[in-house]
């Protein structure tokens, strides 16, 4: 049995998330559980640092993209939202909050602005933005 979740504020189209096919969770109340990850979209504009603090206060982190397969629902995300990816000028890499380096071919990084933070947009794109710019954000919690 599938339950349709209508998240018009976050997704480009109706997203169906299986509720009984396999157990997923636990997740905080009202968060989306999908393939062993919990997600929540926050429709309030904060800069990257404030967004990070907000996620941390809920025992979560900003969105981390680690698998196109496990996170295929992210293909449908609309608009732009802070994720947990930051630029490390000293070695030229893009790094997640947990210190891991962005894997090649996982995201297309696009220079939209001078900046050291990145916004997530549909189809696995990361838009470089000034970390001080207010944007909506996505928090994520791993369940396993």
């Amino acid at each position: 049995i599938w339950s349709a979740v209508f998240l018009n504020s976050l997704f480009n189209q109706e997203v169906q998330i299986p509720l009984t096919e396999s157990y997923c969770g636990p997740c905080p109340k009202n968060w989306i559980c999908y393939k062993n990850n919990c997600y929540q979209f926050f429709d309030e504009s904060k800069n990257w640092y404030e967004s990070q603090a907000s996620c941390m206060s809920q025992n979560a982190s900003l969105l981390k993209v680690y698998s196109k397969e496990d996170q295929d629902l992210l293909k449908l995300v609309k608009s732009y939202h802070w994720m947990g990816l930051v630029h490390i000028p000293t070695n030229g890499s893009w790094q997640w909050e947990d210190g891991s380096i962005l894997s090649p071919n996982l995201l297309t990084i696009i220079e939209m602005q001078k900046g050291d933070c990145a916004l997530y947009a549909s189809s696995f794109k990361g838009y470089i933005e000034n970390c001080s710019t207010p944007n909506t954000y996505i928090c994520m919690q791993r369940t396993v």
Partner: antibody, heavy 119, light 106 residues
């Protein structure tokens, strides 16, 4: 491999406008910003501005009123237009790209095009 | 605008000597970048983010500094190092370059 190549008129009369084209290969203008930098003969480097992947621009405020940067993504070309040229606009004009996504330094430069302002 | 002042303007050294050139910023910056330019050529990326050597740059080059004071050092100068070296910052708009230090080999 990443390459940038400038082409310009060479000689421009005072008070006239300048148009230079930067043709790029080895990367897409929909992913990277392209910068313009100039260097008067025997002098240092001056940053003119940048056009980002999405088409937004930043300019050096000292030249902003005379400067316009645009691009054609499908032709992989970036355009610099400068109005009201004076003798001291005589310079080598370079286009450049960052060393990688988000770099605040220039890893790739064109060979430059010489612009002489003279009547 | 952040002004970058390079010193000395001209530096003369003999092969094998250690040389240091400095770049001072009018306000604090997070990182400094350096380029090498030889006559008739485009600038080449040389050191980025204060201390990282660009691809192909010999290990005798190093960069250091923080705040408003940065430097480029060559441990043992060679004839091929003769060039003008420019520092660059982009802590804030506009991006600015120093006026350059010309390294001459005796």
């Amino acid at each position: 491999q990443v390459q940038l190549q400038e082409s310009g008129p060479g000689l421009v009369a005072p008070s006239q406008s300048l148009s230079i084209t930067c043709t790029v290969s080895g990367f897409s203008l929909t992913s990277y910003g392209v910068h313009w930098i100039r260097q008067p003969p025997g002098k240092g480097l001056e940053w003119l501005g940048v056009i980002w992947a999405g088409g937004s621009t930043n300019y050096n405020s000292a030249l902003m009123s005379r400067l316009s940067i645009s691009k054609d993504n499908s032709k992989s070309q970036v355009f610099l237009k400068m109005n009201s040229l004076q003798i001291d606009d005589t310079a080598m004009y370079y286009c450049a790209r960052g060393g990688y996504e988000g770099a605040a330094w220039f890893g790739y430069w064109g060979q430059g095009t010489t612009v002489t302002v003279s009547s | 605008d952040i002004q970058l002042t390079q010193s000395p303007a001209i530096l003369s050294a003999s092969p094998g000597e250690k040389v240091t050139m400095t770049c001072r910023a009018s306000s604090s910056v997070s990182y400094m970048h350096w380029y090498q330019q030889k006559p008739g050529s485009s600038p080449k990326p040389w050191i980025y983010a204060t201390s990282n050597l660009a691809s192909g740059v010999p290990a005798r080059f190093s960069g250091s500094g923080s705040g408003t004071s940065y430097s480029l050092t060559i441990s043992r100068v060679e004839a091929e190092d003769a060039a003008t070296y420019y520092c660059q910052q982009w802590n804030s708009n506009p991006l600015t370059f120093g006026a350059g230090t010309k390294l001459e080999i005796k």
